[in-house]
């Protein structure tokens, strides 16, 4: 057991298995479920994280998967197909040959169909609105302090460039964080807004994906910011294609 083995961990993803068996004895970590090698200097893609989550023993799951008829709090949990880069494949199918198209954050964007369903491309989610309600506090948070703290959080914890945090809106007790990232804006090495939003969502739920770190301790000028509910809205570069039947339901 060497020091190298002690150091061989994945700080950004605890759902991995690591060993110093990479090229030249370097540390290499693989995601549970998929066995894909992951880059531990940055966030792991949501697709690989969902796959790892679904591969975990049933009793290790902290959340109950809701029925497919549930409209609110549907965790969107399914065992996804990921491409060699760890992104969601445009078409996802379940074990009963029901298929649907997803966007880059793995959210369904078409009606469900059968194996003949075609999803020509993975449509990018370029705008994410994170809607939070915080627990009552003595007074409202200072907007500019809140803005700075959330930008700092997304940079320092989730490695997201501040330019992708488009705005932070606040009307007590509601906080809205807008993330925007067009295909043309995202450079190699940039964290994807969808991955950052997913890590944030899991942190807020007390299910941190980081290795050995304490949970998220959000404070604005020393005052704890405790979130009591979260809603996340996804806007795609190409609008979703749902039938009128669904829209009028």
């Amino acid at each position: 057991h060497t020091a190298a083995q002690d150091n061989c961990t994945c700080p950004t993803n605890k759902m991995t298995v690591c060993s110093p068996d990479g090229p030249g004895g370097r540390c290499q970590c693989r995601a549970l479920g998929s066995g894909m090698a992951v880059d531990c200097s940055t966030l792991t893609s949501k697709c690989l994280l969902l796959k790892a989550r679904m591969s975990a023993p049933k009793n290790a799951r902290t959340l109950v998967r809701p029925s497919e008829h549930a409209l609110v709090d549907n965790d969107g949990l399914y065992d996804p197909d990921c491409d060699p880069e760890g992104r969601f494949k445009a078409r996802q199918c379940n074990q009963t040959s029901v298929c649907w198209c997803v966007n880059s954050v793995g959210v369904r964007r078409t009606d469900k169909g059968d194996l003949s369903l075609r999803c020509d491309e993975l449509v990018r989610t370029h705008h994410i609105l994170i809607d939070l309600r915080h627990r009552p506090t003595a007074g409202a948070f200072n907007h500019s302090d809140l803005d700075a703290e959330l930008r700092r959080l997304f940079r320092e914890r989730y490695r997201l460039h501040p330019k992708f945090v488009a705005a932070v809106h606040y009307e007590q007790p509601t906080i809205q964080i807008e993330l925007r990232q067009n295909t043309s804006q995202k450079a190699a090495g940039d964290v994807d807004i969808g991955d950052a939003a997913y890590y944030f969502e899991r942190d807020i739920k007390g299910e941190s994906l980081f290795q050995g770190r304490g949970g998220l301790d959000l404070r604005v000028r020393g005052e704890p910011l405790q979130v009591e509910r979260t809603l996340i809205y996804y806007l795609d570069e190409i609008p979703p294609k749902f039938s009128m039947k669904r829209l009028t339901a």
Epitope: T2, G22, G25, C27, C29, D39, C40, R152, E156, R159
Partner: antibody, heavy 122, light 109 residues
Framework: QQLEESGGGLVKPEGSLTLTCKGS????????WMWWVRQAPGKGLEWIA?????????TYYASWAKGRFTISSTSSTAVTLQATSLTAADTATYFC???????????????WGPGTLVTVSS | FEMTQTPSSVSEPVGGTVTIKCQAS??????LGWYQQKPGQPPKLLIY???TLASGVPSRFKGSGSGTEFTLTISDLEPADAATYYC????????????FGGGTEVVVK
Amino acid sequence: QQLEESGGGLVKPEGSLTLTCKGSGFDFSGTYWMWWVRQAPGKGLEWIAPIYVGSGSSTYYASWAKGRFTISSTSSTAVTLQATSLTAADTATYFCARGATNNVFMNYFNLWGPGTLVTVSS
Amino acid sequence: FEMTQTPSSVSEPVGGTVTIKCQASEDISSNLGWYQQKPGQPPKLLIYGASTLASGVPSRFKGSGSGTEFTLTISDLEPADAATYYCQTSYYIDDGVNGFGGGTEVVVK
């Protein structure tokens, strides 16, 4: 714990070279970043590139270094910097340094090599 | 993104106090380091996280600030403090810009 650079010396303009950084007392297999930083004679410090030496080998490059400099880590004991199309402006002492955290955006350098001098001249 | 360090040179007597300022063109929170470099030597980390003293560094060195304005204060100057001091951040490394300040030469009279 120590770092040592090698590979410096006299290079002709338009030439190329490879610098190597080796560590002793620790493995380049942890959850941190290794950096190359340079300093022209009598001038300030400027970073060239870091590489993550844990799982993944992520890299970043200074704008001016893209295309001419390549950082790599093929083993758990060394990091290399390859430089091409060198000019007199690349004459400098080249340092390797270890970043103290896993987060590249919150990095500071807690261990430095003594540096190796590269002189580009005909 | 740019780090602006002032002054470029300062001279103070033994026992005096020197203040070096570093300004970031954008908010970098508390992600700033200070280094001391003597001729022919590599830089030495003095302070990280804007105000935390690195191991073995005397408490005469004090770092402060956050956001865009930072200060290094060296009190009770000693001859051994004669060196060039640099501030540094990697907060915007993905923009490909240099995160080091231009340096401040401290002369101890």
